[in-house]
Interface confidence: low
């Protein structure tokens, strides 16, 4: 398996976000397909879960991103991506998008840092 | 206006060490991690390692682990990079930079000159 | 680490030519990030995530590919695209750049 994120995503406060996570595998996608995604605070705090998805997705039951997050991926497209929602400062951080598709080997996680910015975007700013 | 300040030059003795610096302004110096990148003419970009500002964690190119000490002082929005033993194959301009979405930002360079 | 190999390393066009700049991969990467850069200038991103046009960046370039195969087009070209053009993979660690294309106005 081949994981393939973009490296950086910028948010504004108070809006959702897609975490885009895509995959490749030379087995076929089927019901043992599994993916995992998990948050690195930016703080360097611990390892939190964000979701699971495993035939049916779960979303997690307590925690930070209670009802803040859905699935947004299509595996027979290799999408492996999430819908996170109402964006918090605290929200910073590295997301990490794991998924397994045996037979096929475990592939690197797939890493994407999330910046959660006041209204105005960095990609409005005229570069120096 | 994002800013990502760095001296123009250094030379430095072979065997020496430097410590580069890297201040930011225009944007919160926490939210960014800071990257660092080698340019030696004809032989393209390295990137170097990278550093989380918030706590100071670290992520290195493998062939750079021994040679750069990345830190940061959030009091001053500043980012250093020391590189230790020069030799001639460290001379090169060191670029730091912030990657976003859709835009990166670039210090000027520091061209740093081992010689002696 | 992952290999990205530029070619042409130097090439000449005419004005109004079309231009293609092409980065091989020494294996699969997810995306491409291309940088424009001029004698004495810092680098300027140029295309992000394979196909998008950084801010400013003029219509008339374009980036494609996938897996192994990216290129940066320039339907046609002008006196202020000569430049070194760079690619940059962020799909493995660590990230890695191409030896660049240094593009000339013939």
């Known amino acids: 398996v081949e994981i393939y994120t973009s490296r950086v995503l910028e948010a504004v406060n108070g809006t959702d976000a897609r975490l885009k996570c895509t995959f490749s595998s030379f087995a076929p996608v089927g019901d043992a397909l599994t993916v995992t995604w998990n948050f690195r605070p930016l703080d360097g705090g611990p390892e939190q879960f964000v979701f699971y998805y495993h035939i049916d997705p779960f979303q997690p039951m307590s925690g930070r991103f209670k009802d803040r997050v859905s699935w947004d991926g299509n595996p027979e497209r290799y999408d492996a991506s999430i819908l996170l929602w109402k964006l918090q400062f605290d929200d910073n951080g590295t997301y990490t998008c794991q998924v397994k598709n045996p037979p096929d080997v475990d592939g690197v996680i797939g890493e994407i840092r999330l910046s959660v910015v006041h209204t105005v975007r960095f990609s409005e700013i005229h570069f120096l | 206006q994002v800013q990502l300040q760095q001296p123009g030059a250094e030379l430095v003795k072979p065997g020496a060490s430097v410590k580069l610096s890297c201040k930011a302004s225009?944007?919160?110096?926490?939210n960014y991690w800071m990257h660092w990148v080698k340019l030696r003419p004809g032989q393209g970009f390295e990137w170097?390692?990278?550093?989380?500002?918030?706590?100071?964690?670290?992520d290195y190119n493998e062939k750079f682990k021994r040679k750069a000490t990345l830190t940061v002082d959030k009091s001053s929005s500043t980012a250093y990079m020391q590189l230790s033993s020069l030799t001639s194959e460290d001379s090169a301009v060191y670029y730091c930079t912030i990657y976003t979405t859709a835009l990166d930002y670039w210090g000027q360079g520091t061209t740093l000159t081992v010689s002696s | 680490q992952i290999v990205l190999t530029q070619s042409p390393a130097l090439m000449s066009a005419s004005p109004g030519e079309r231009v293609t700049l092409t980065c091989s991969a020494s294996?699969?990467?997810?995306?491409m990030y291309w940088y424009q850069q001029k004698p004495g200038s810092s680098p300027k991103p140029w295309i992000y995530?394979?196909?998008n046009l950084a801010s400013g960046v003029p219509a008339r370039f374009s980036g494609s590919g996938s897996g192994t195969s990216y290129s940066l087009t320039i339907s046609s070209m002008e006196a202020e695209d000569a430049a070194t053009y760079y690619c940059?993979?962020?799909?493995?660690?660590?990230?890695?750049f191409g030896a660049g294309t240094k593009l000339e106005l013939k």
């Open positions: 995530v394979t196909s």
């Open positions: 940059q993979q962020w799909s493995s660690n660590p990230p890695t």
């Open positions: 225009g944007y919160t110096f926490t």
């Open positions: 170097i390692g990278e550093i989380n500002p918030t706590n100071g964690g670290t």
């Open positions: 294996s699969s990467v997810g995306y």
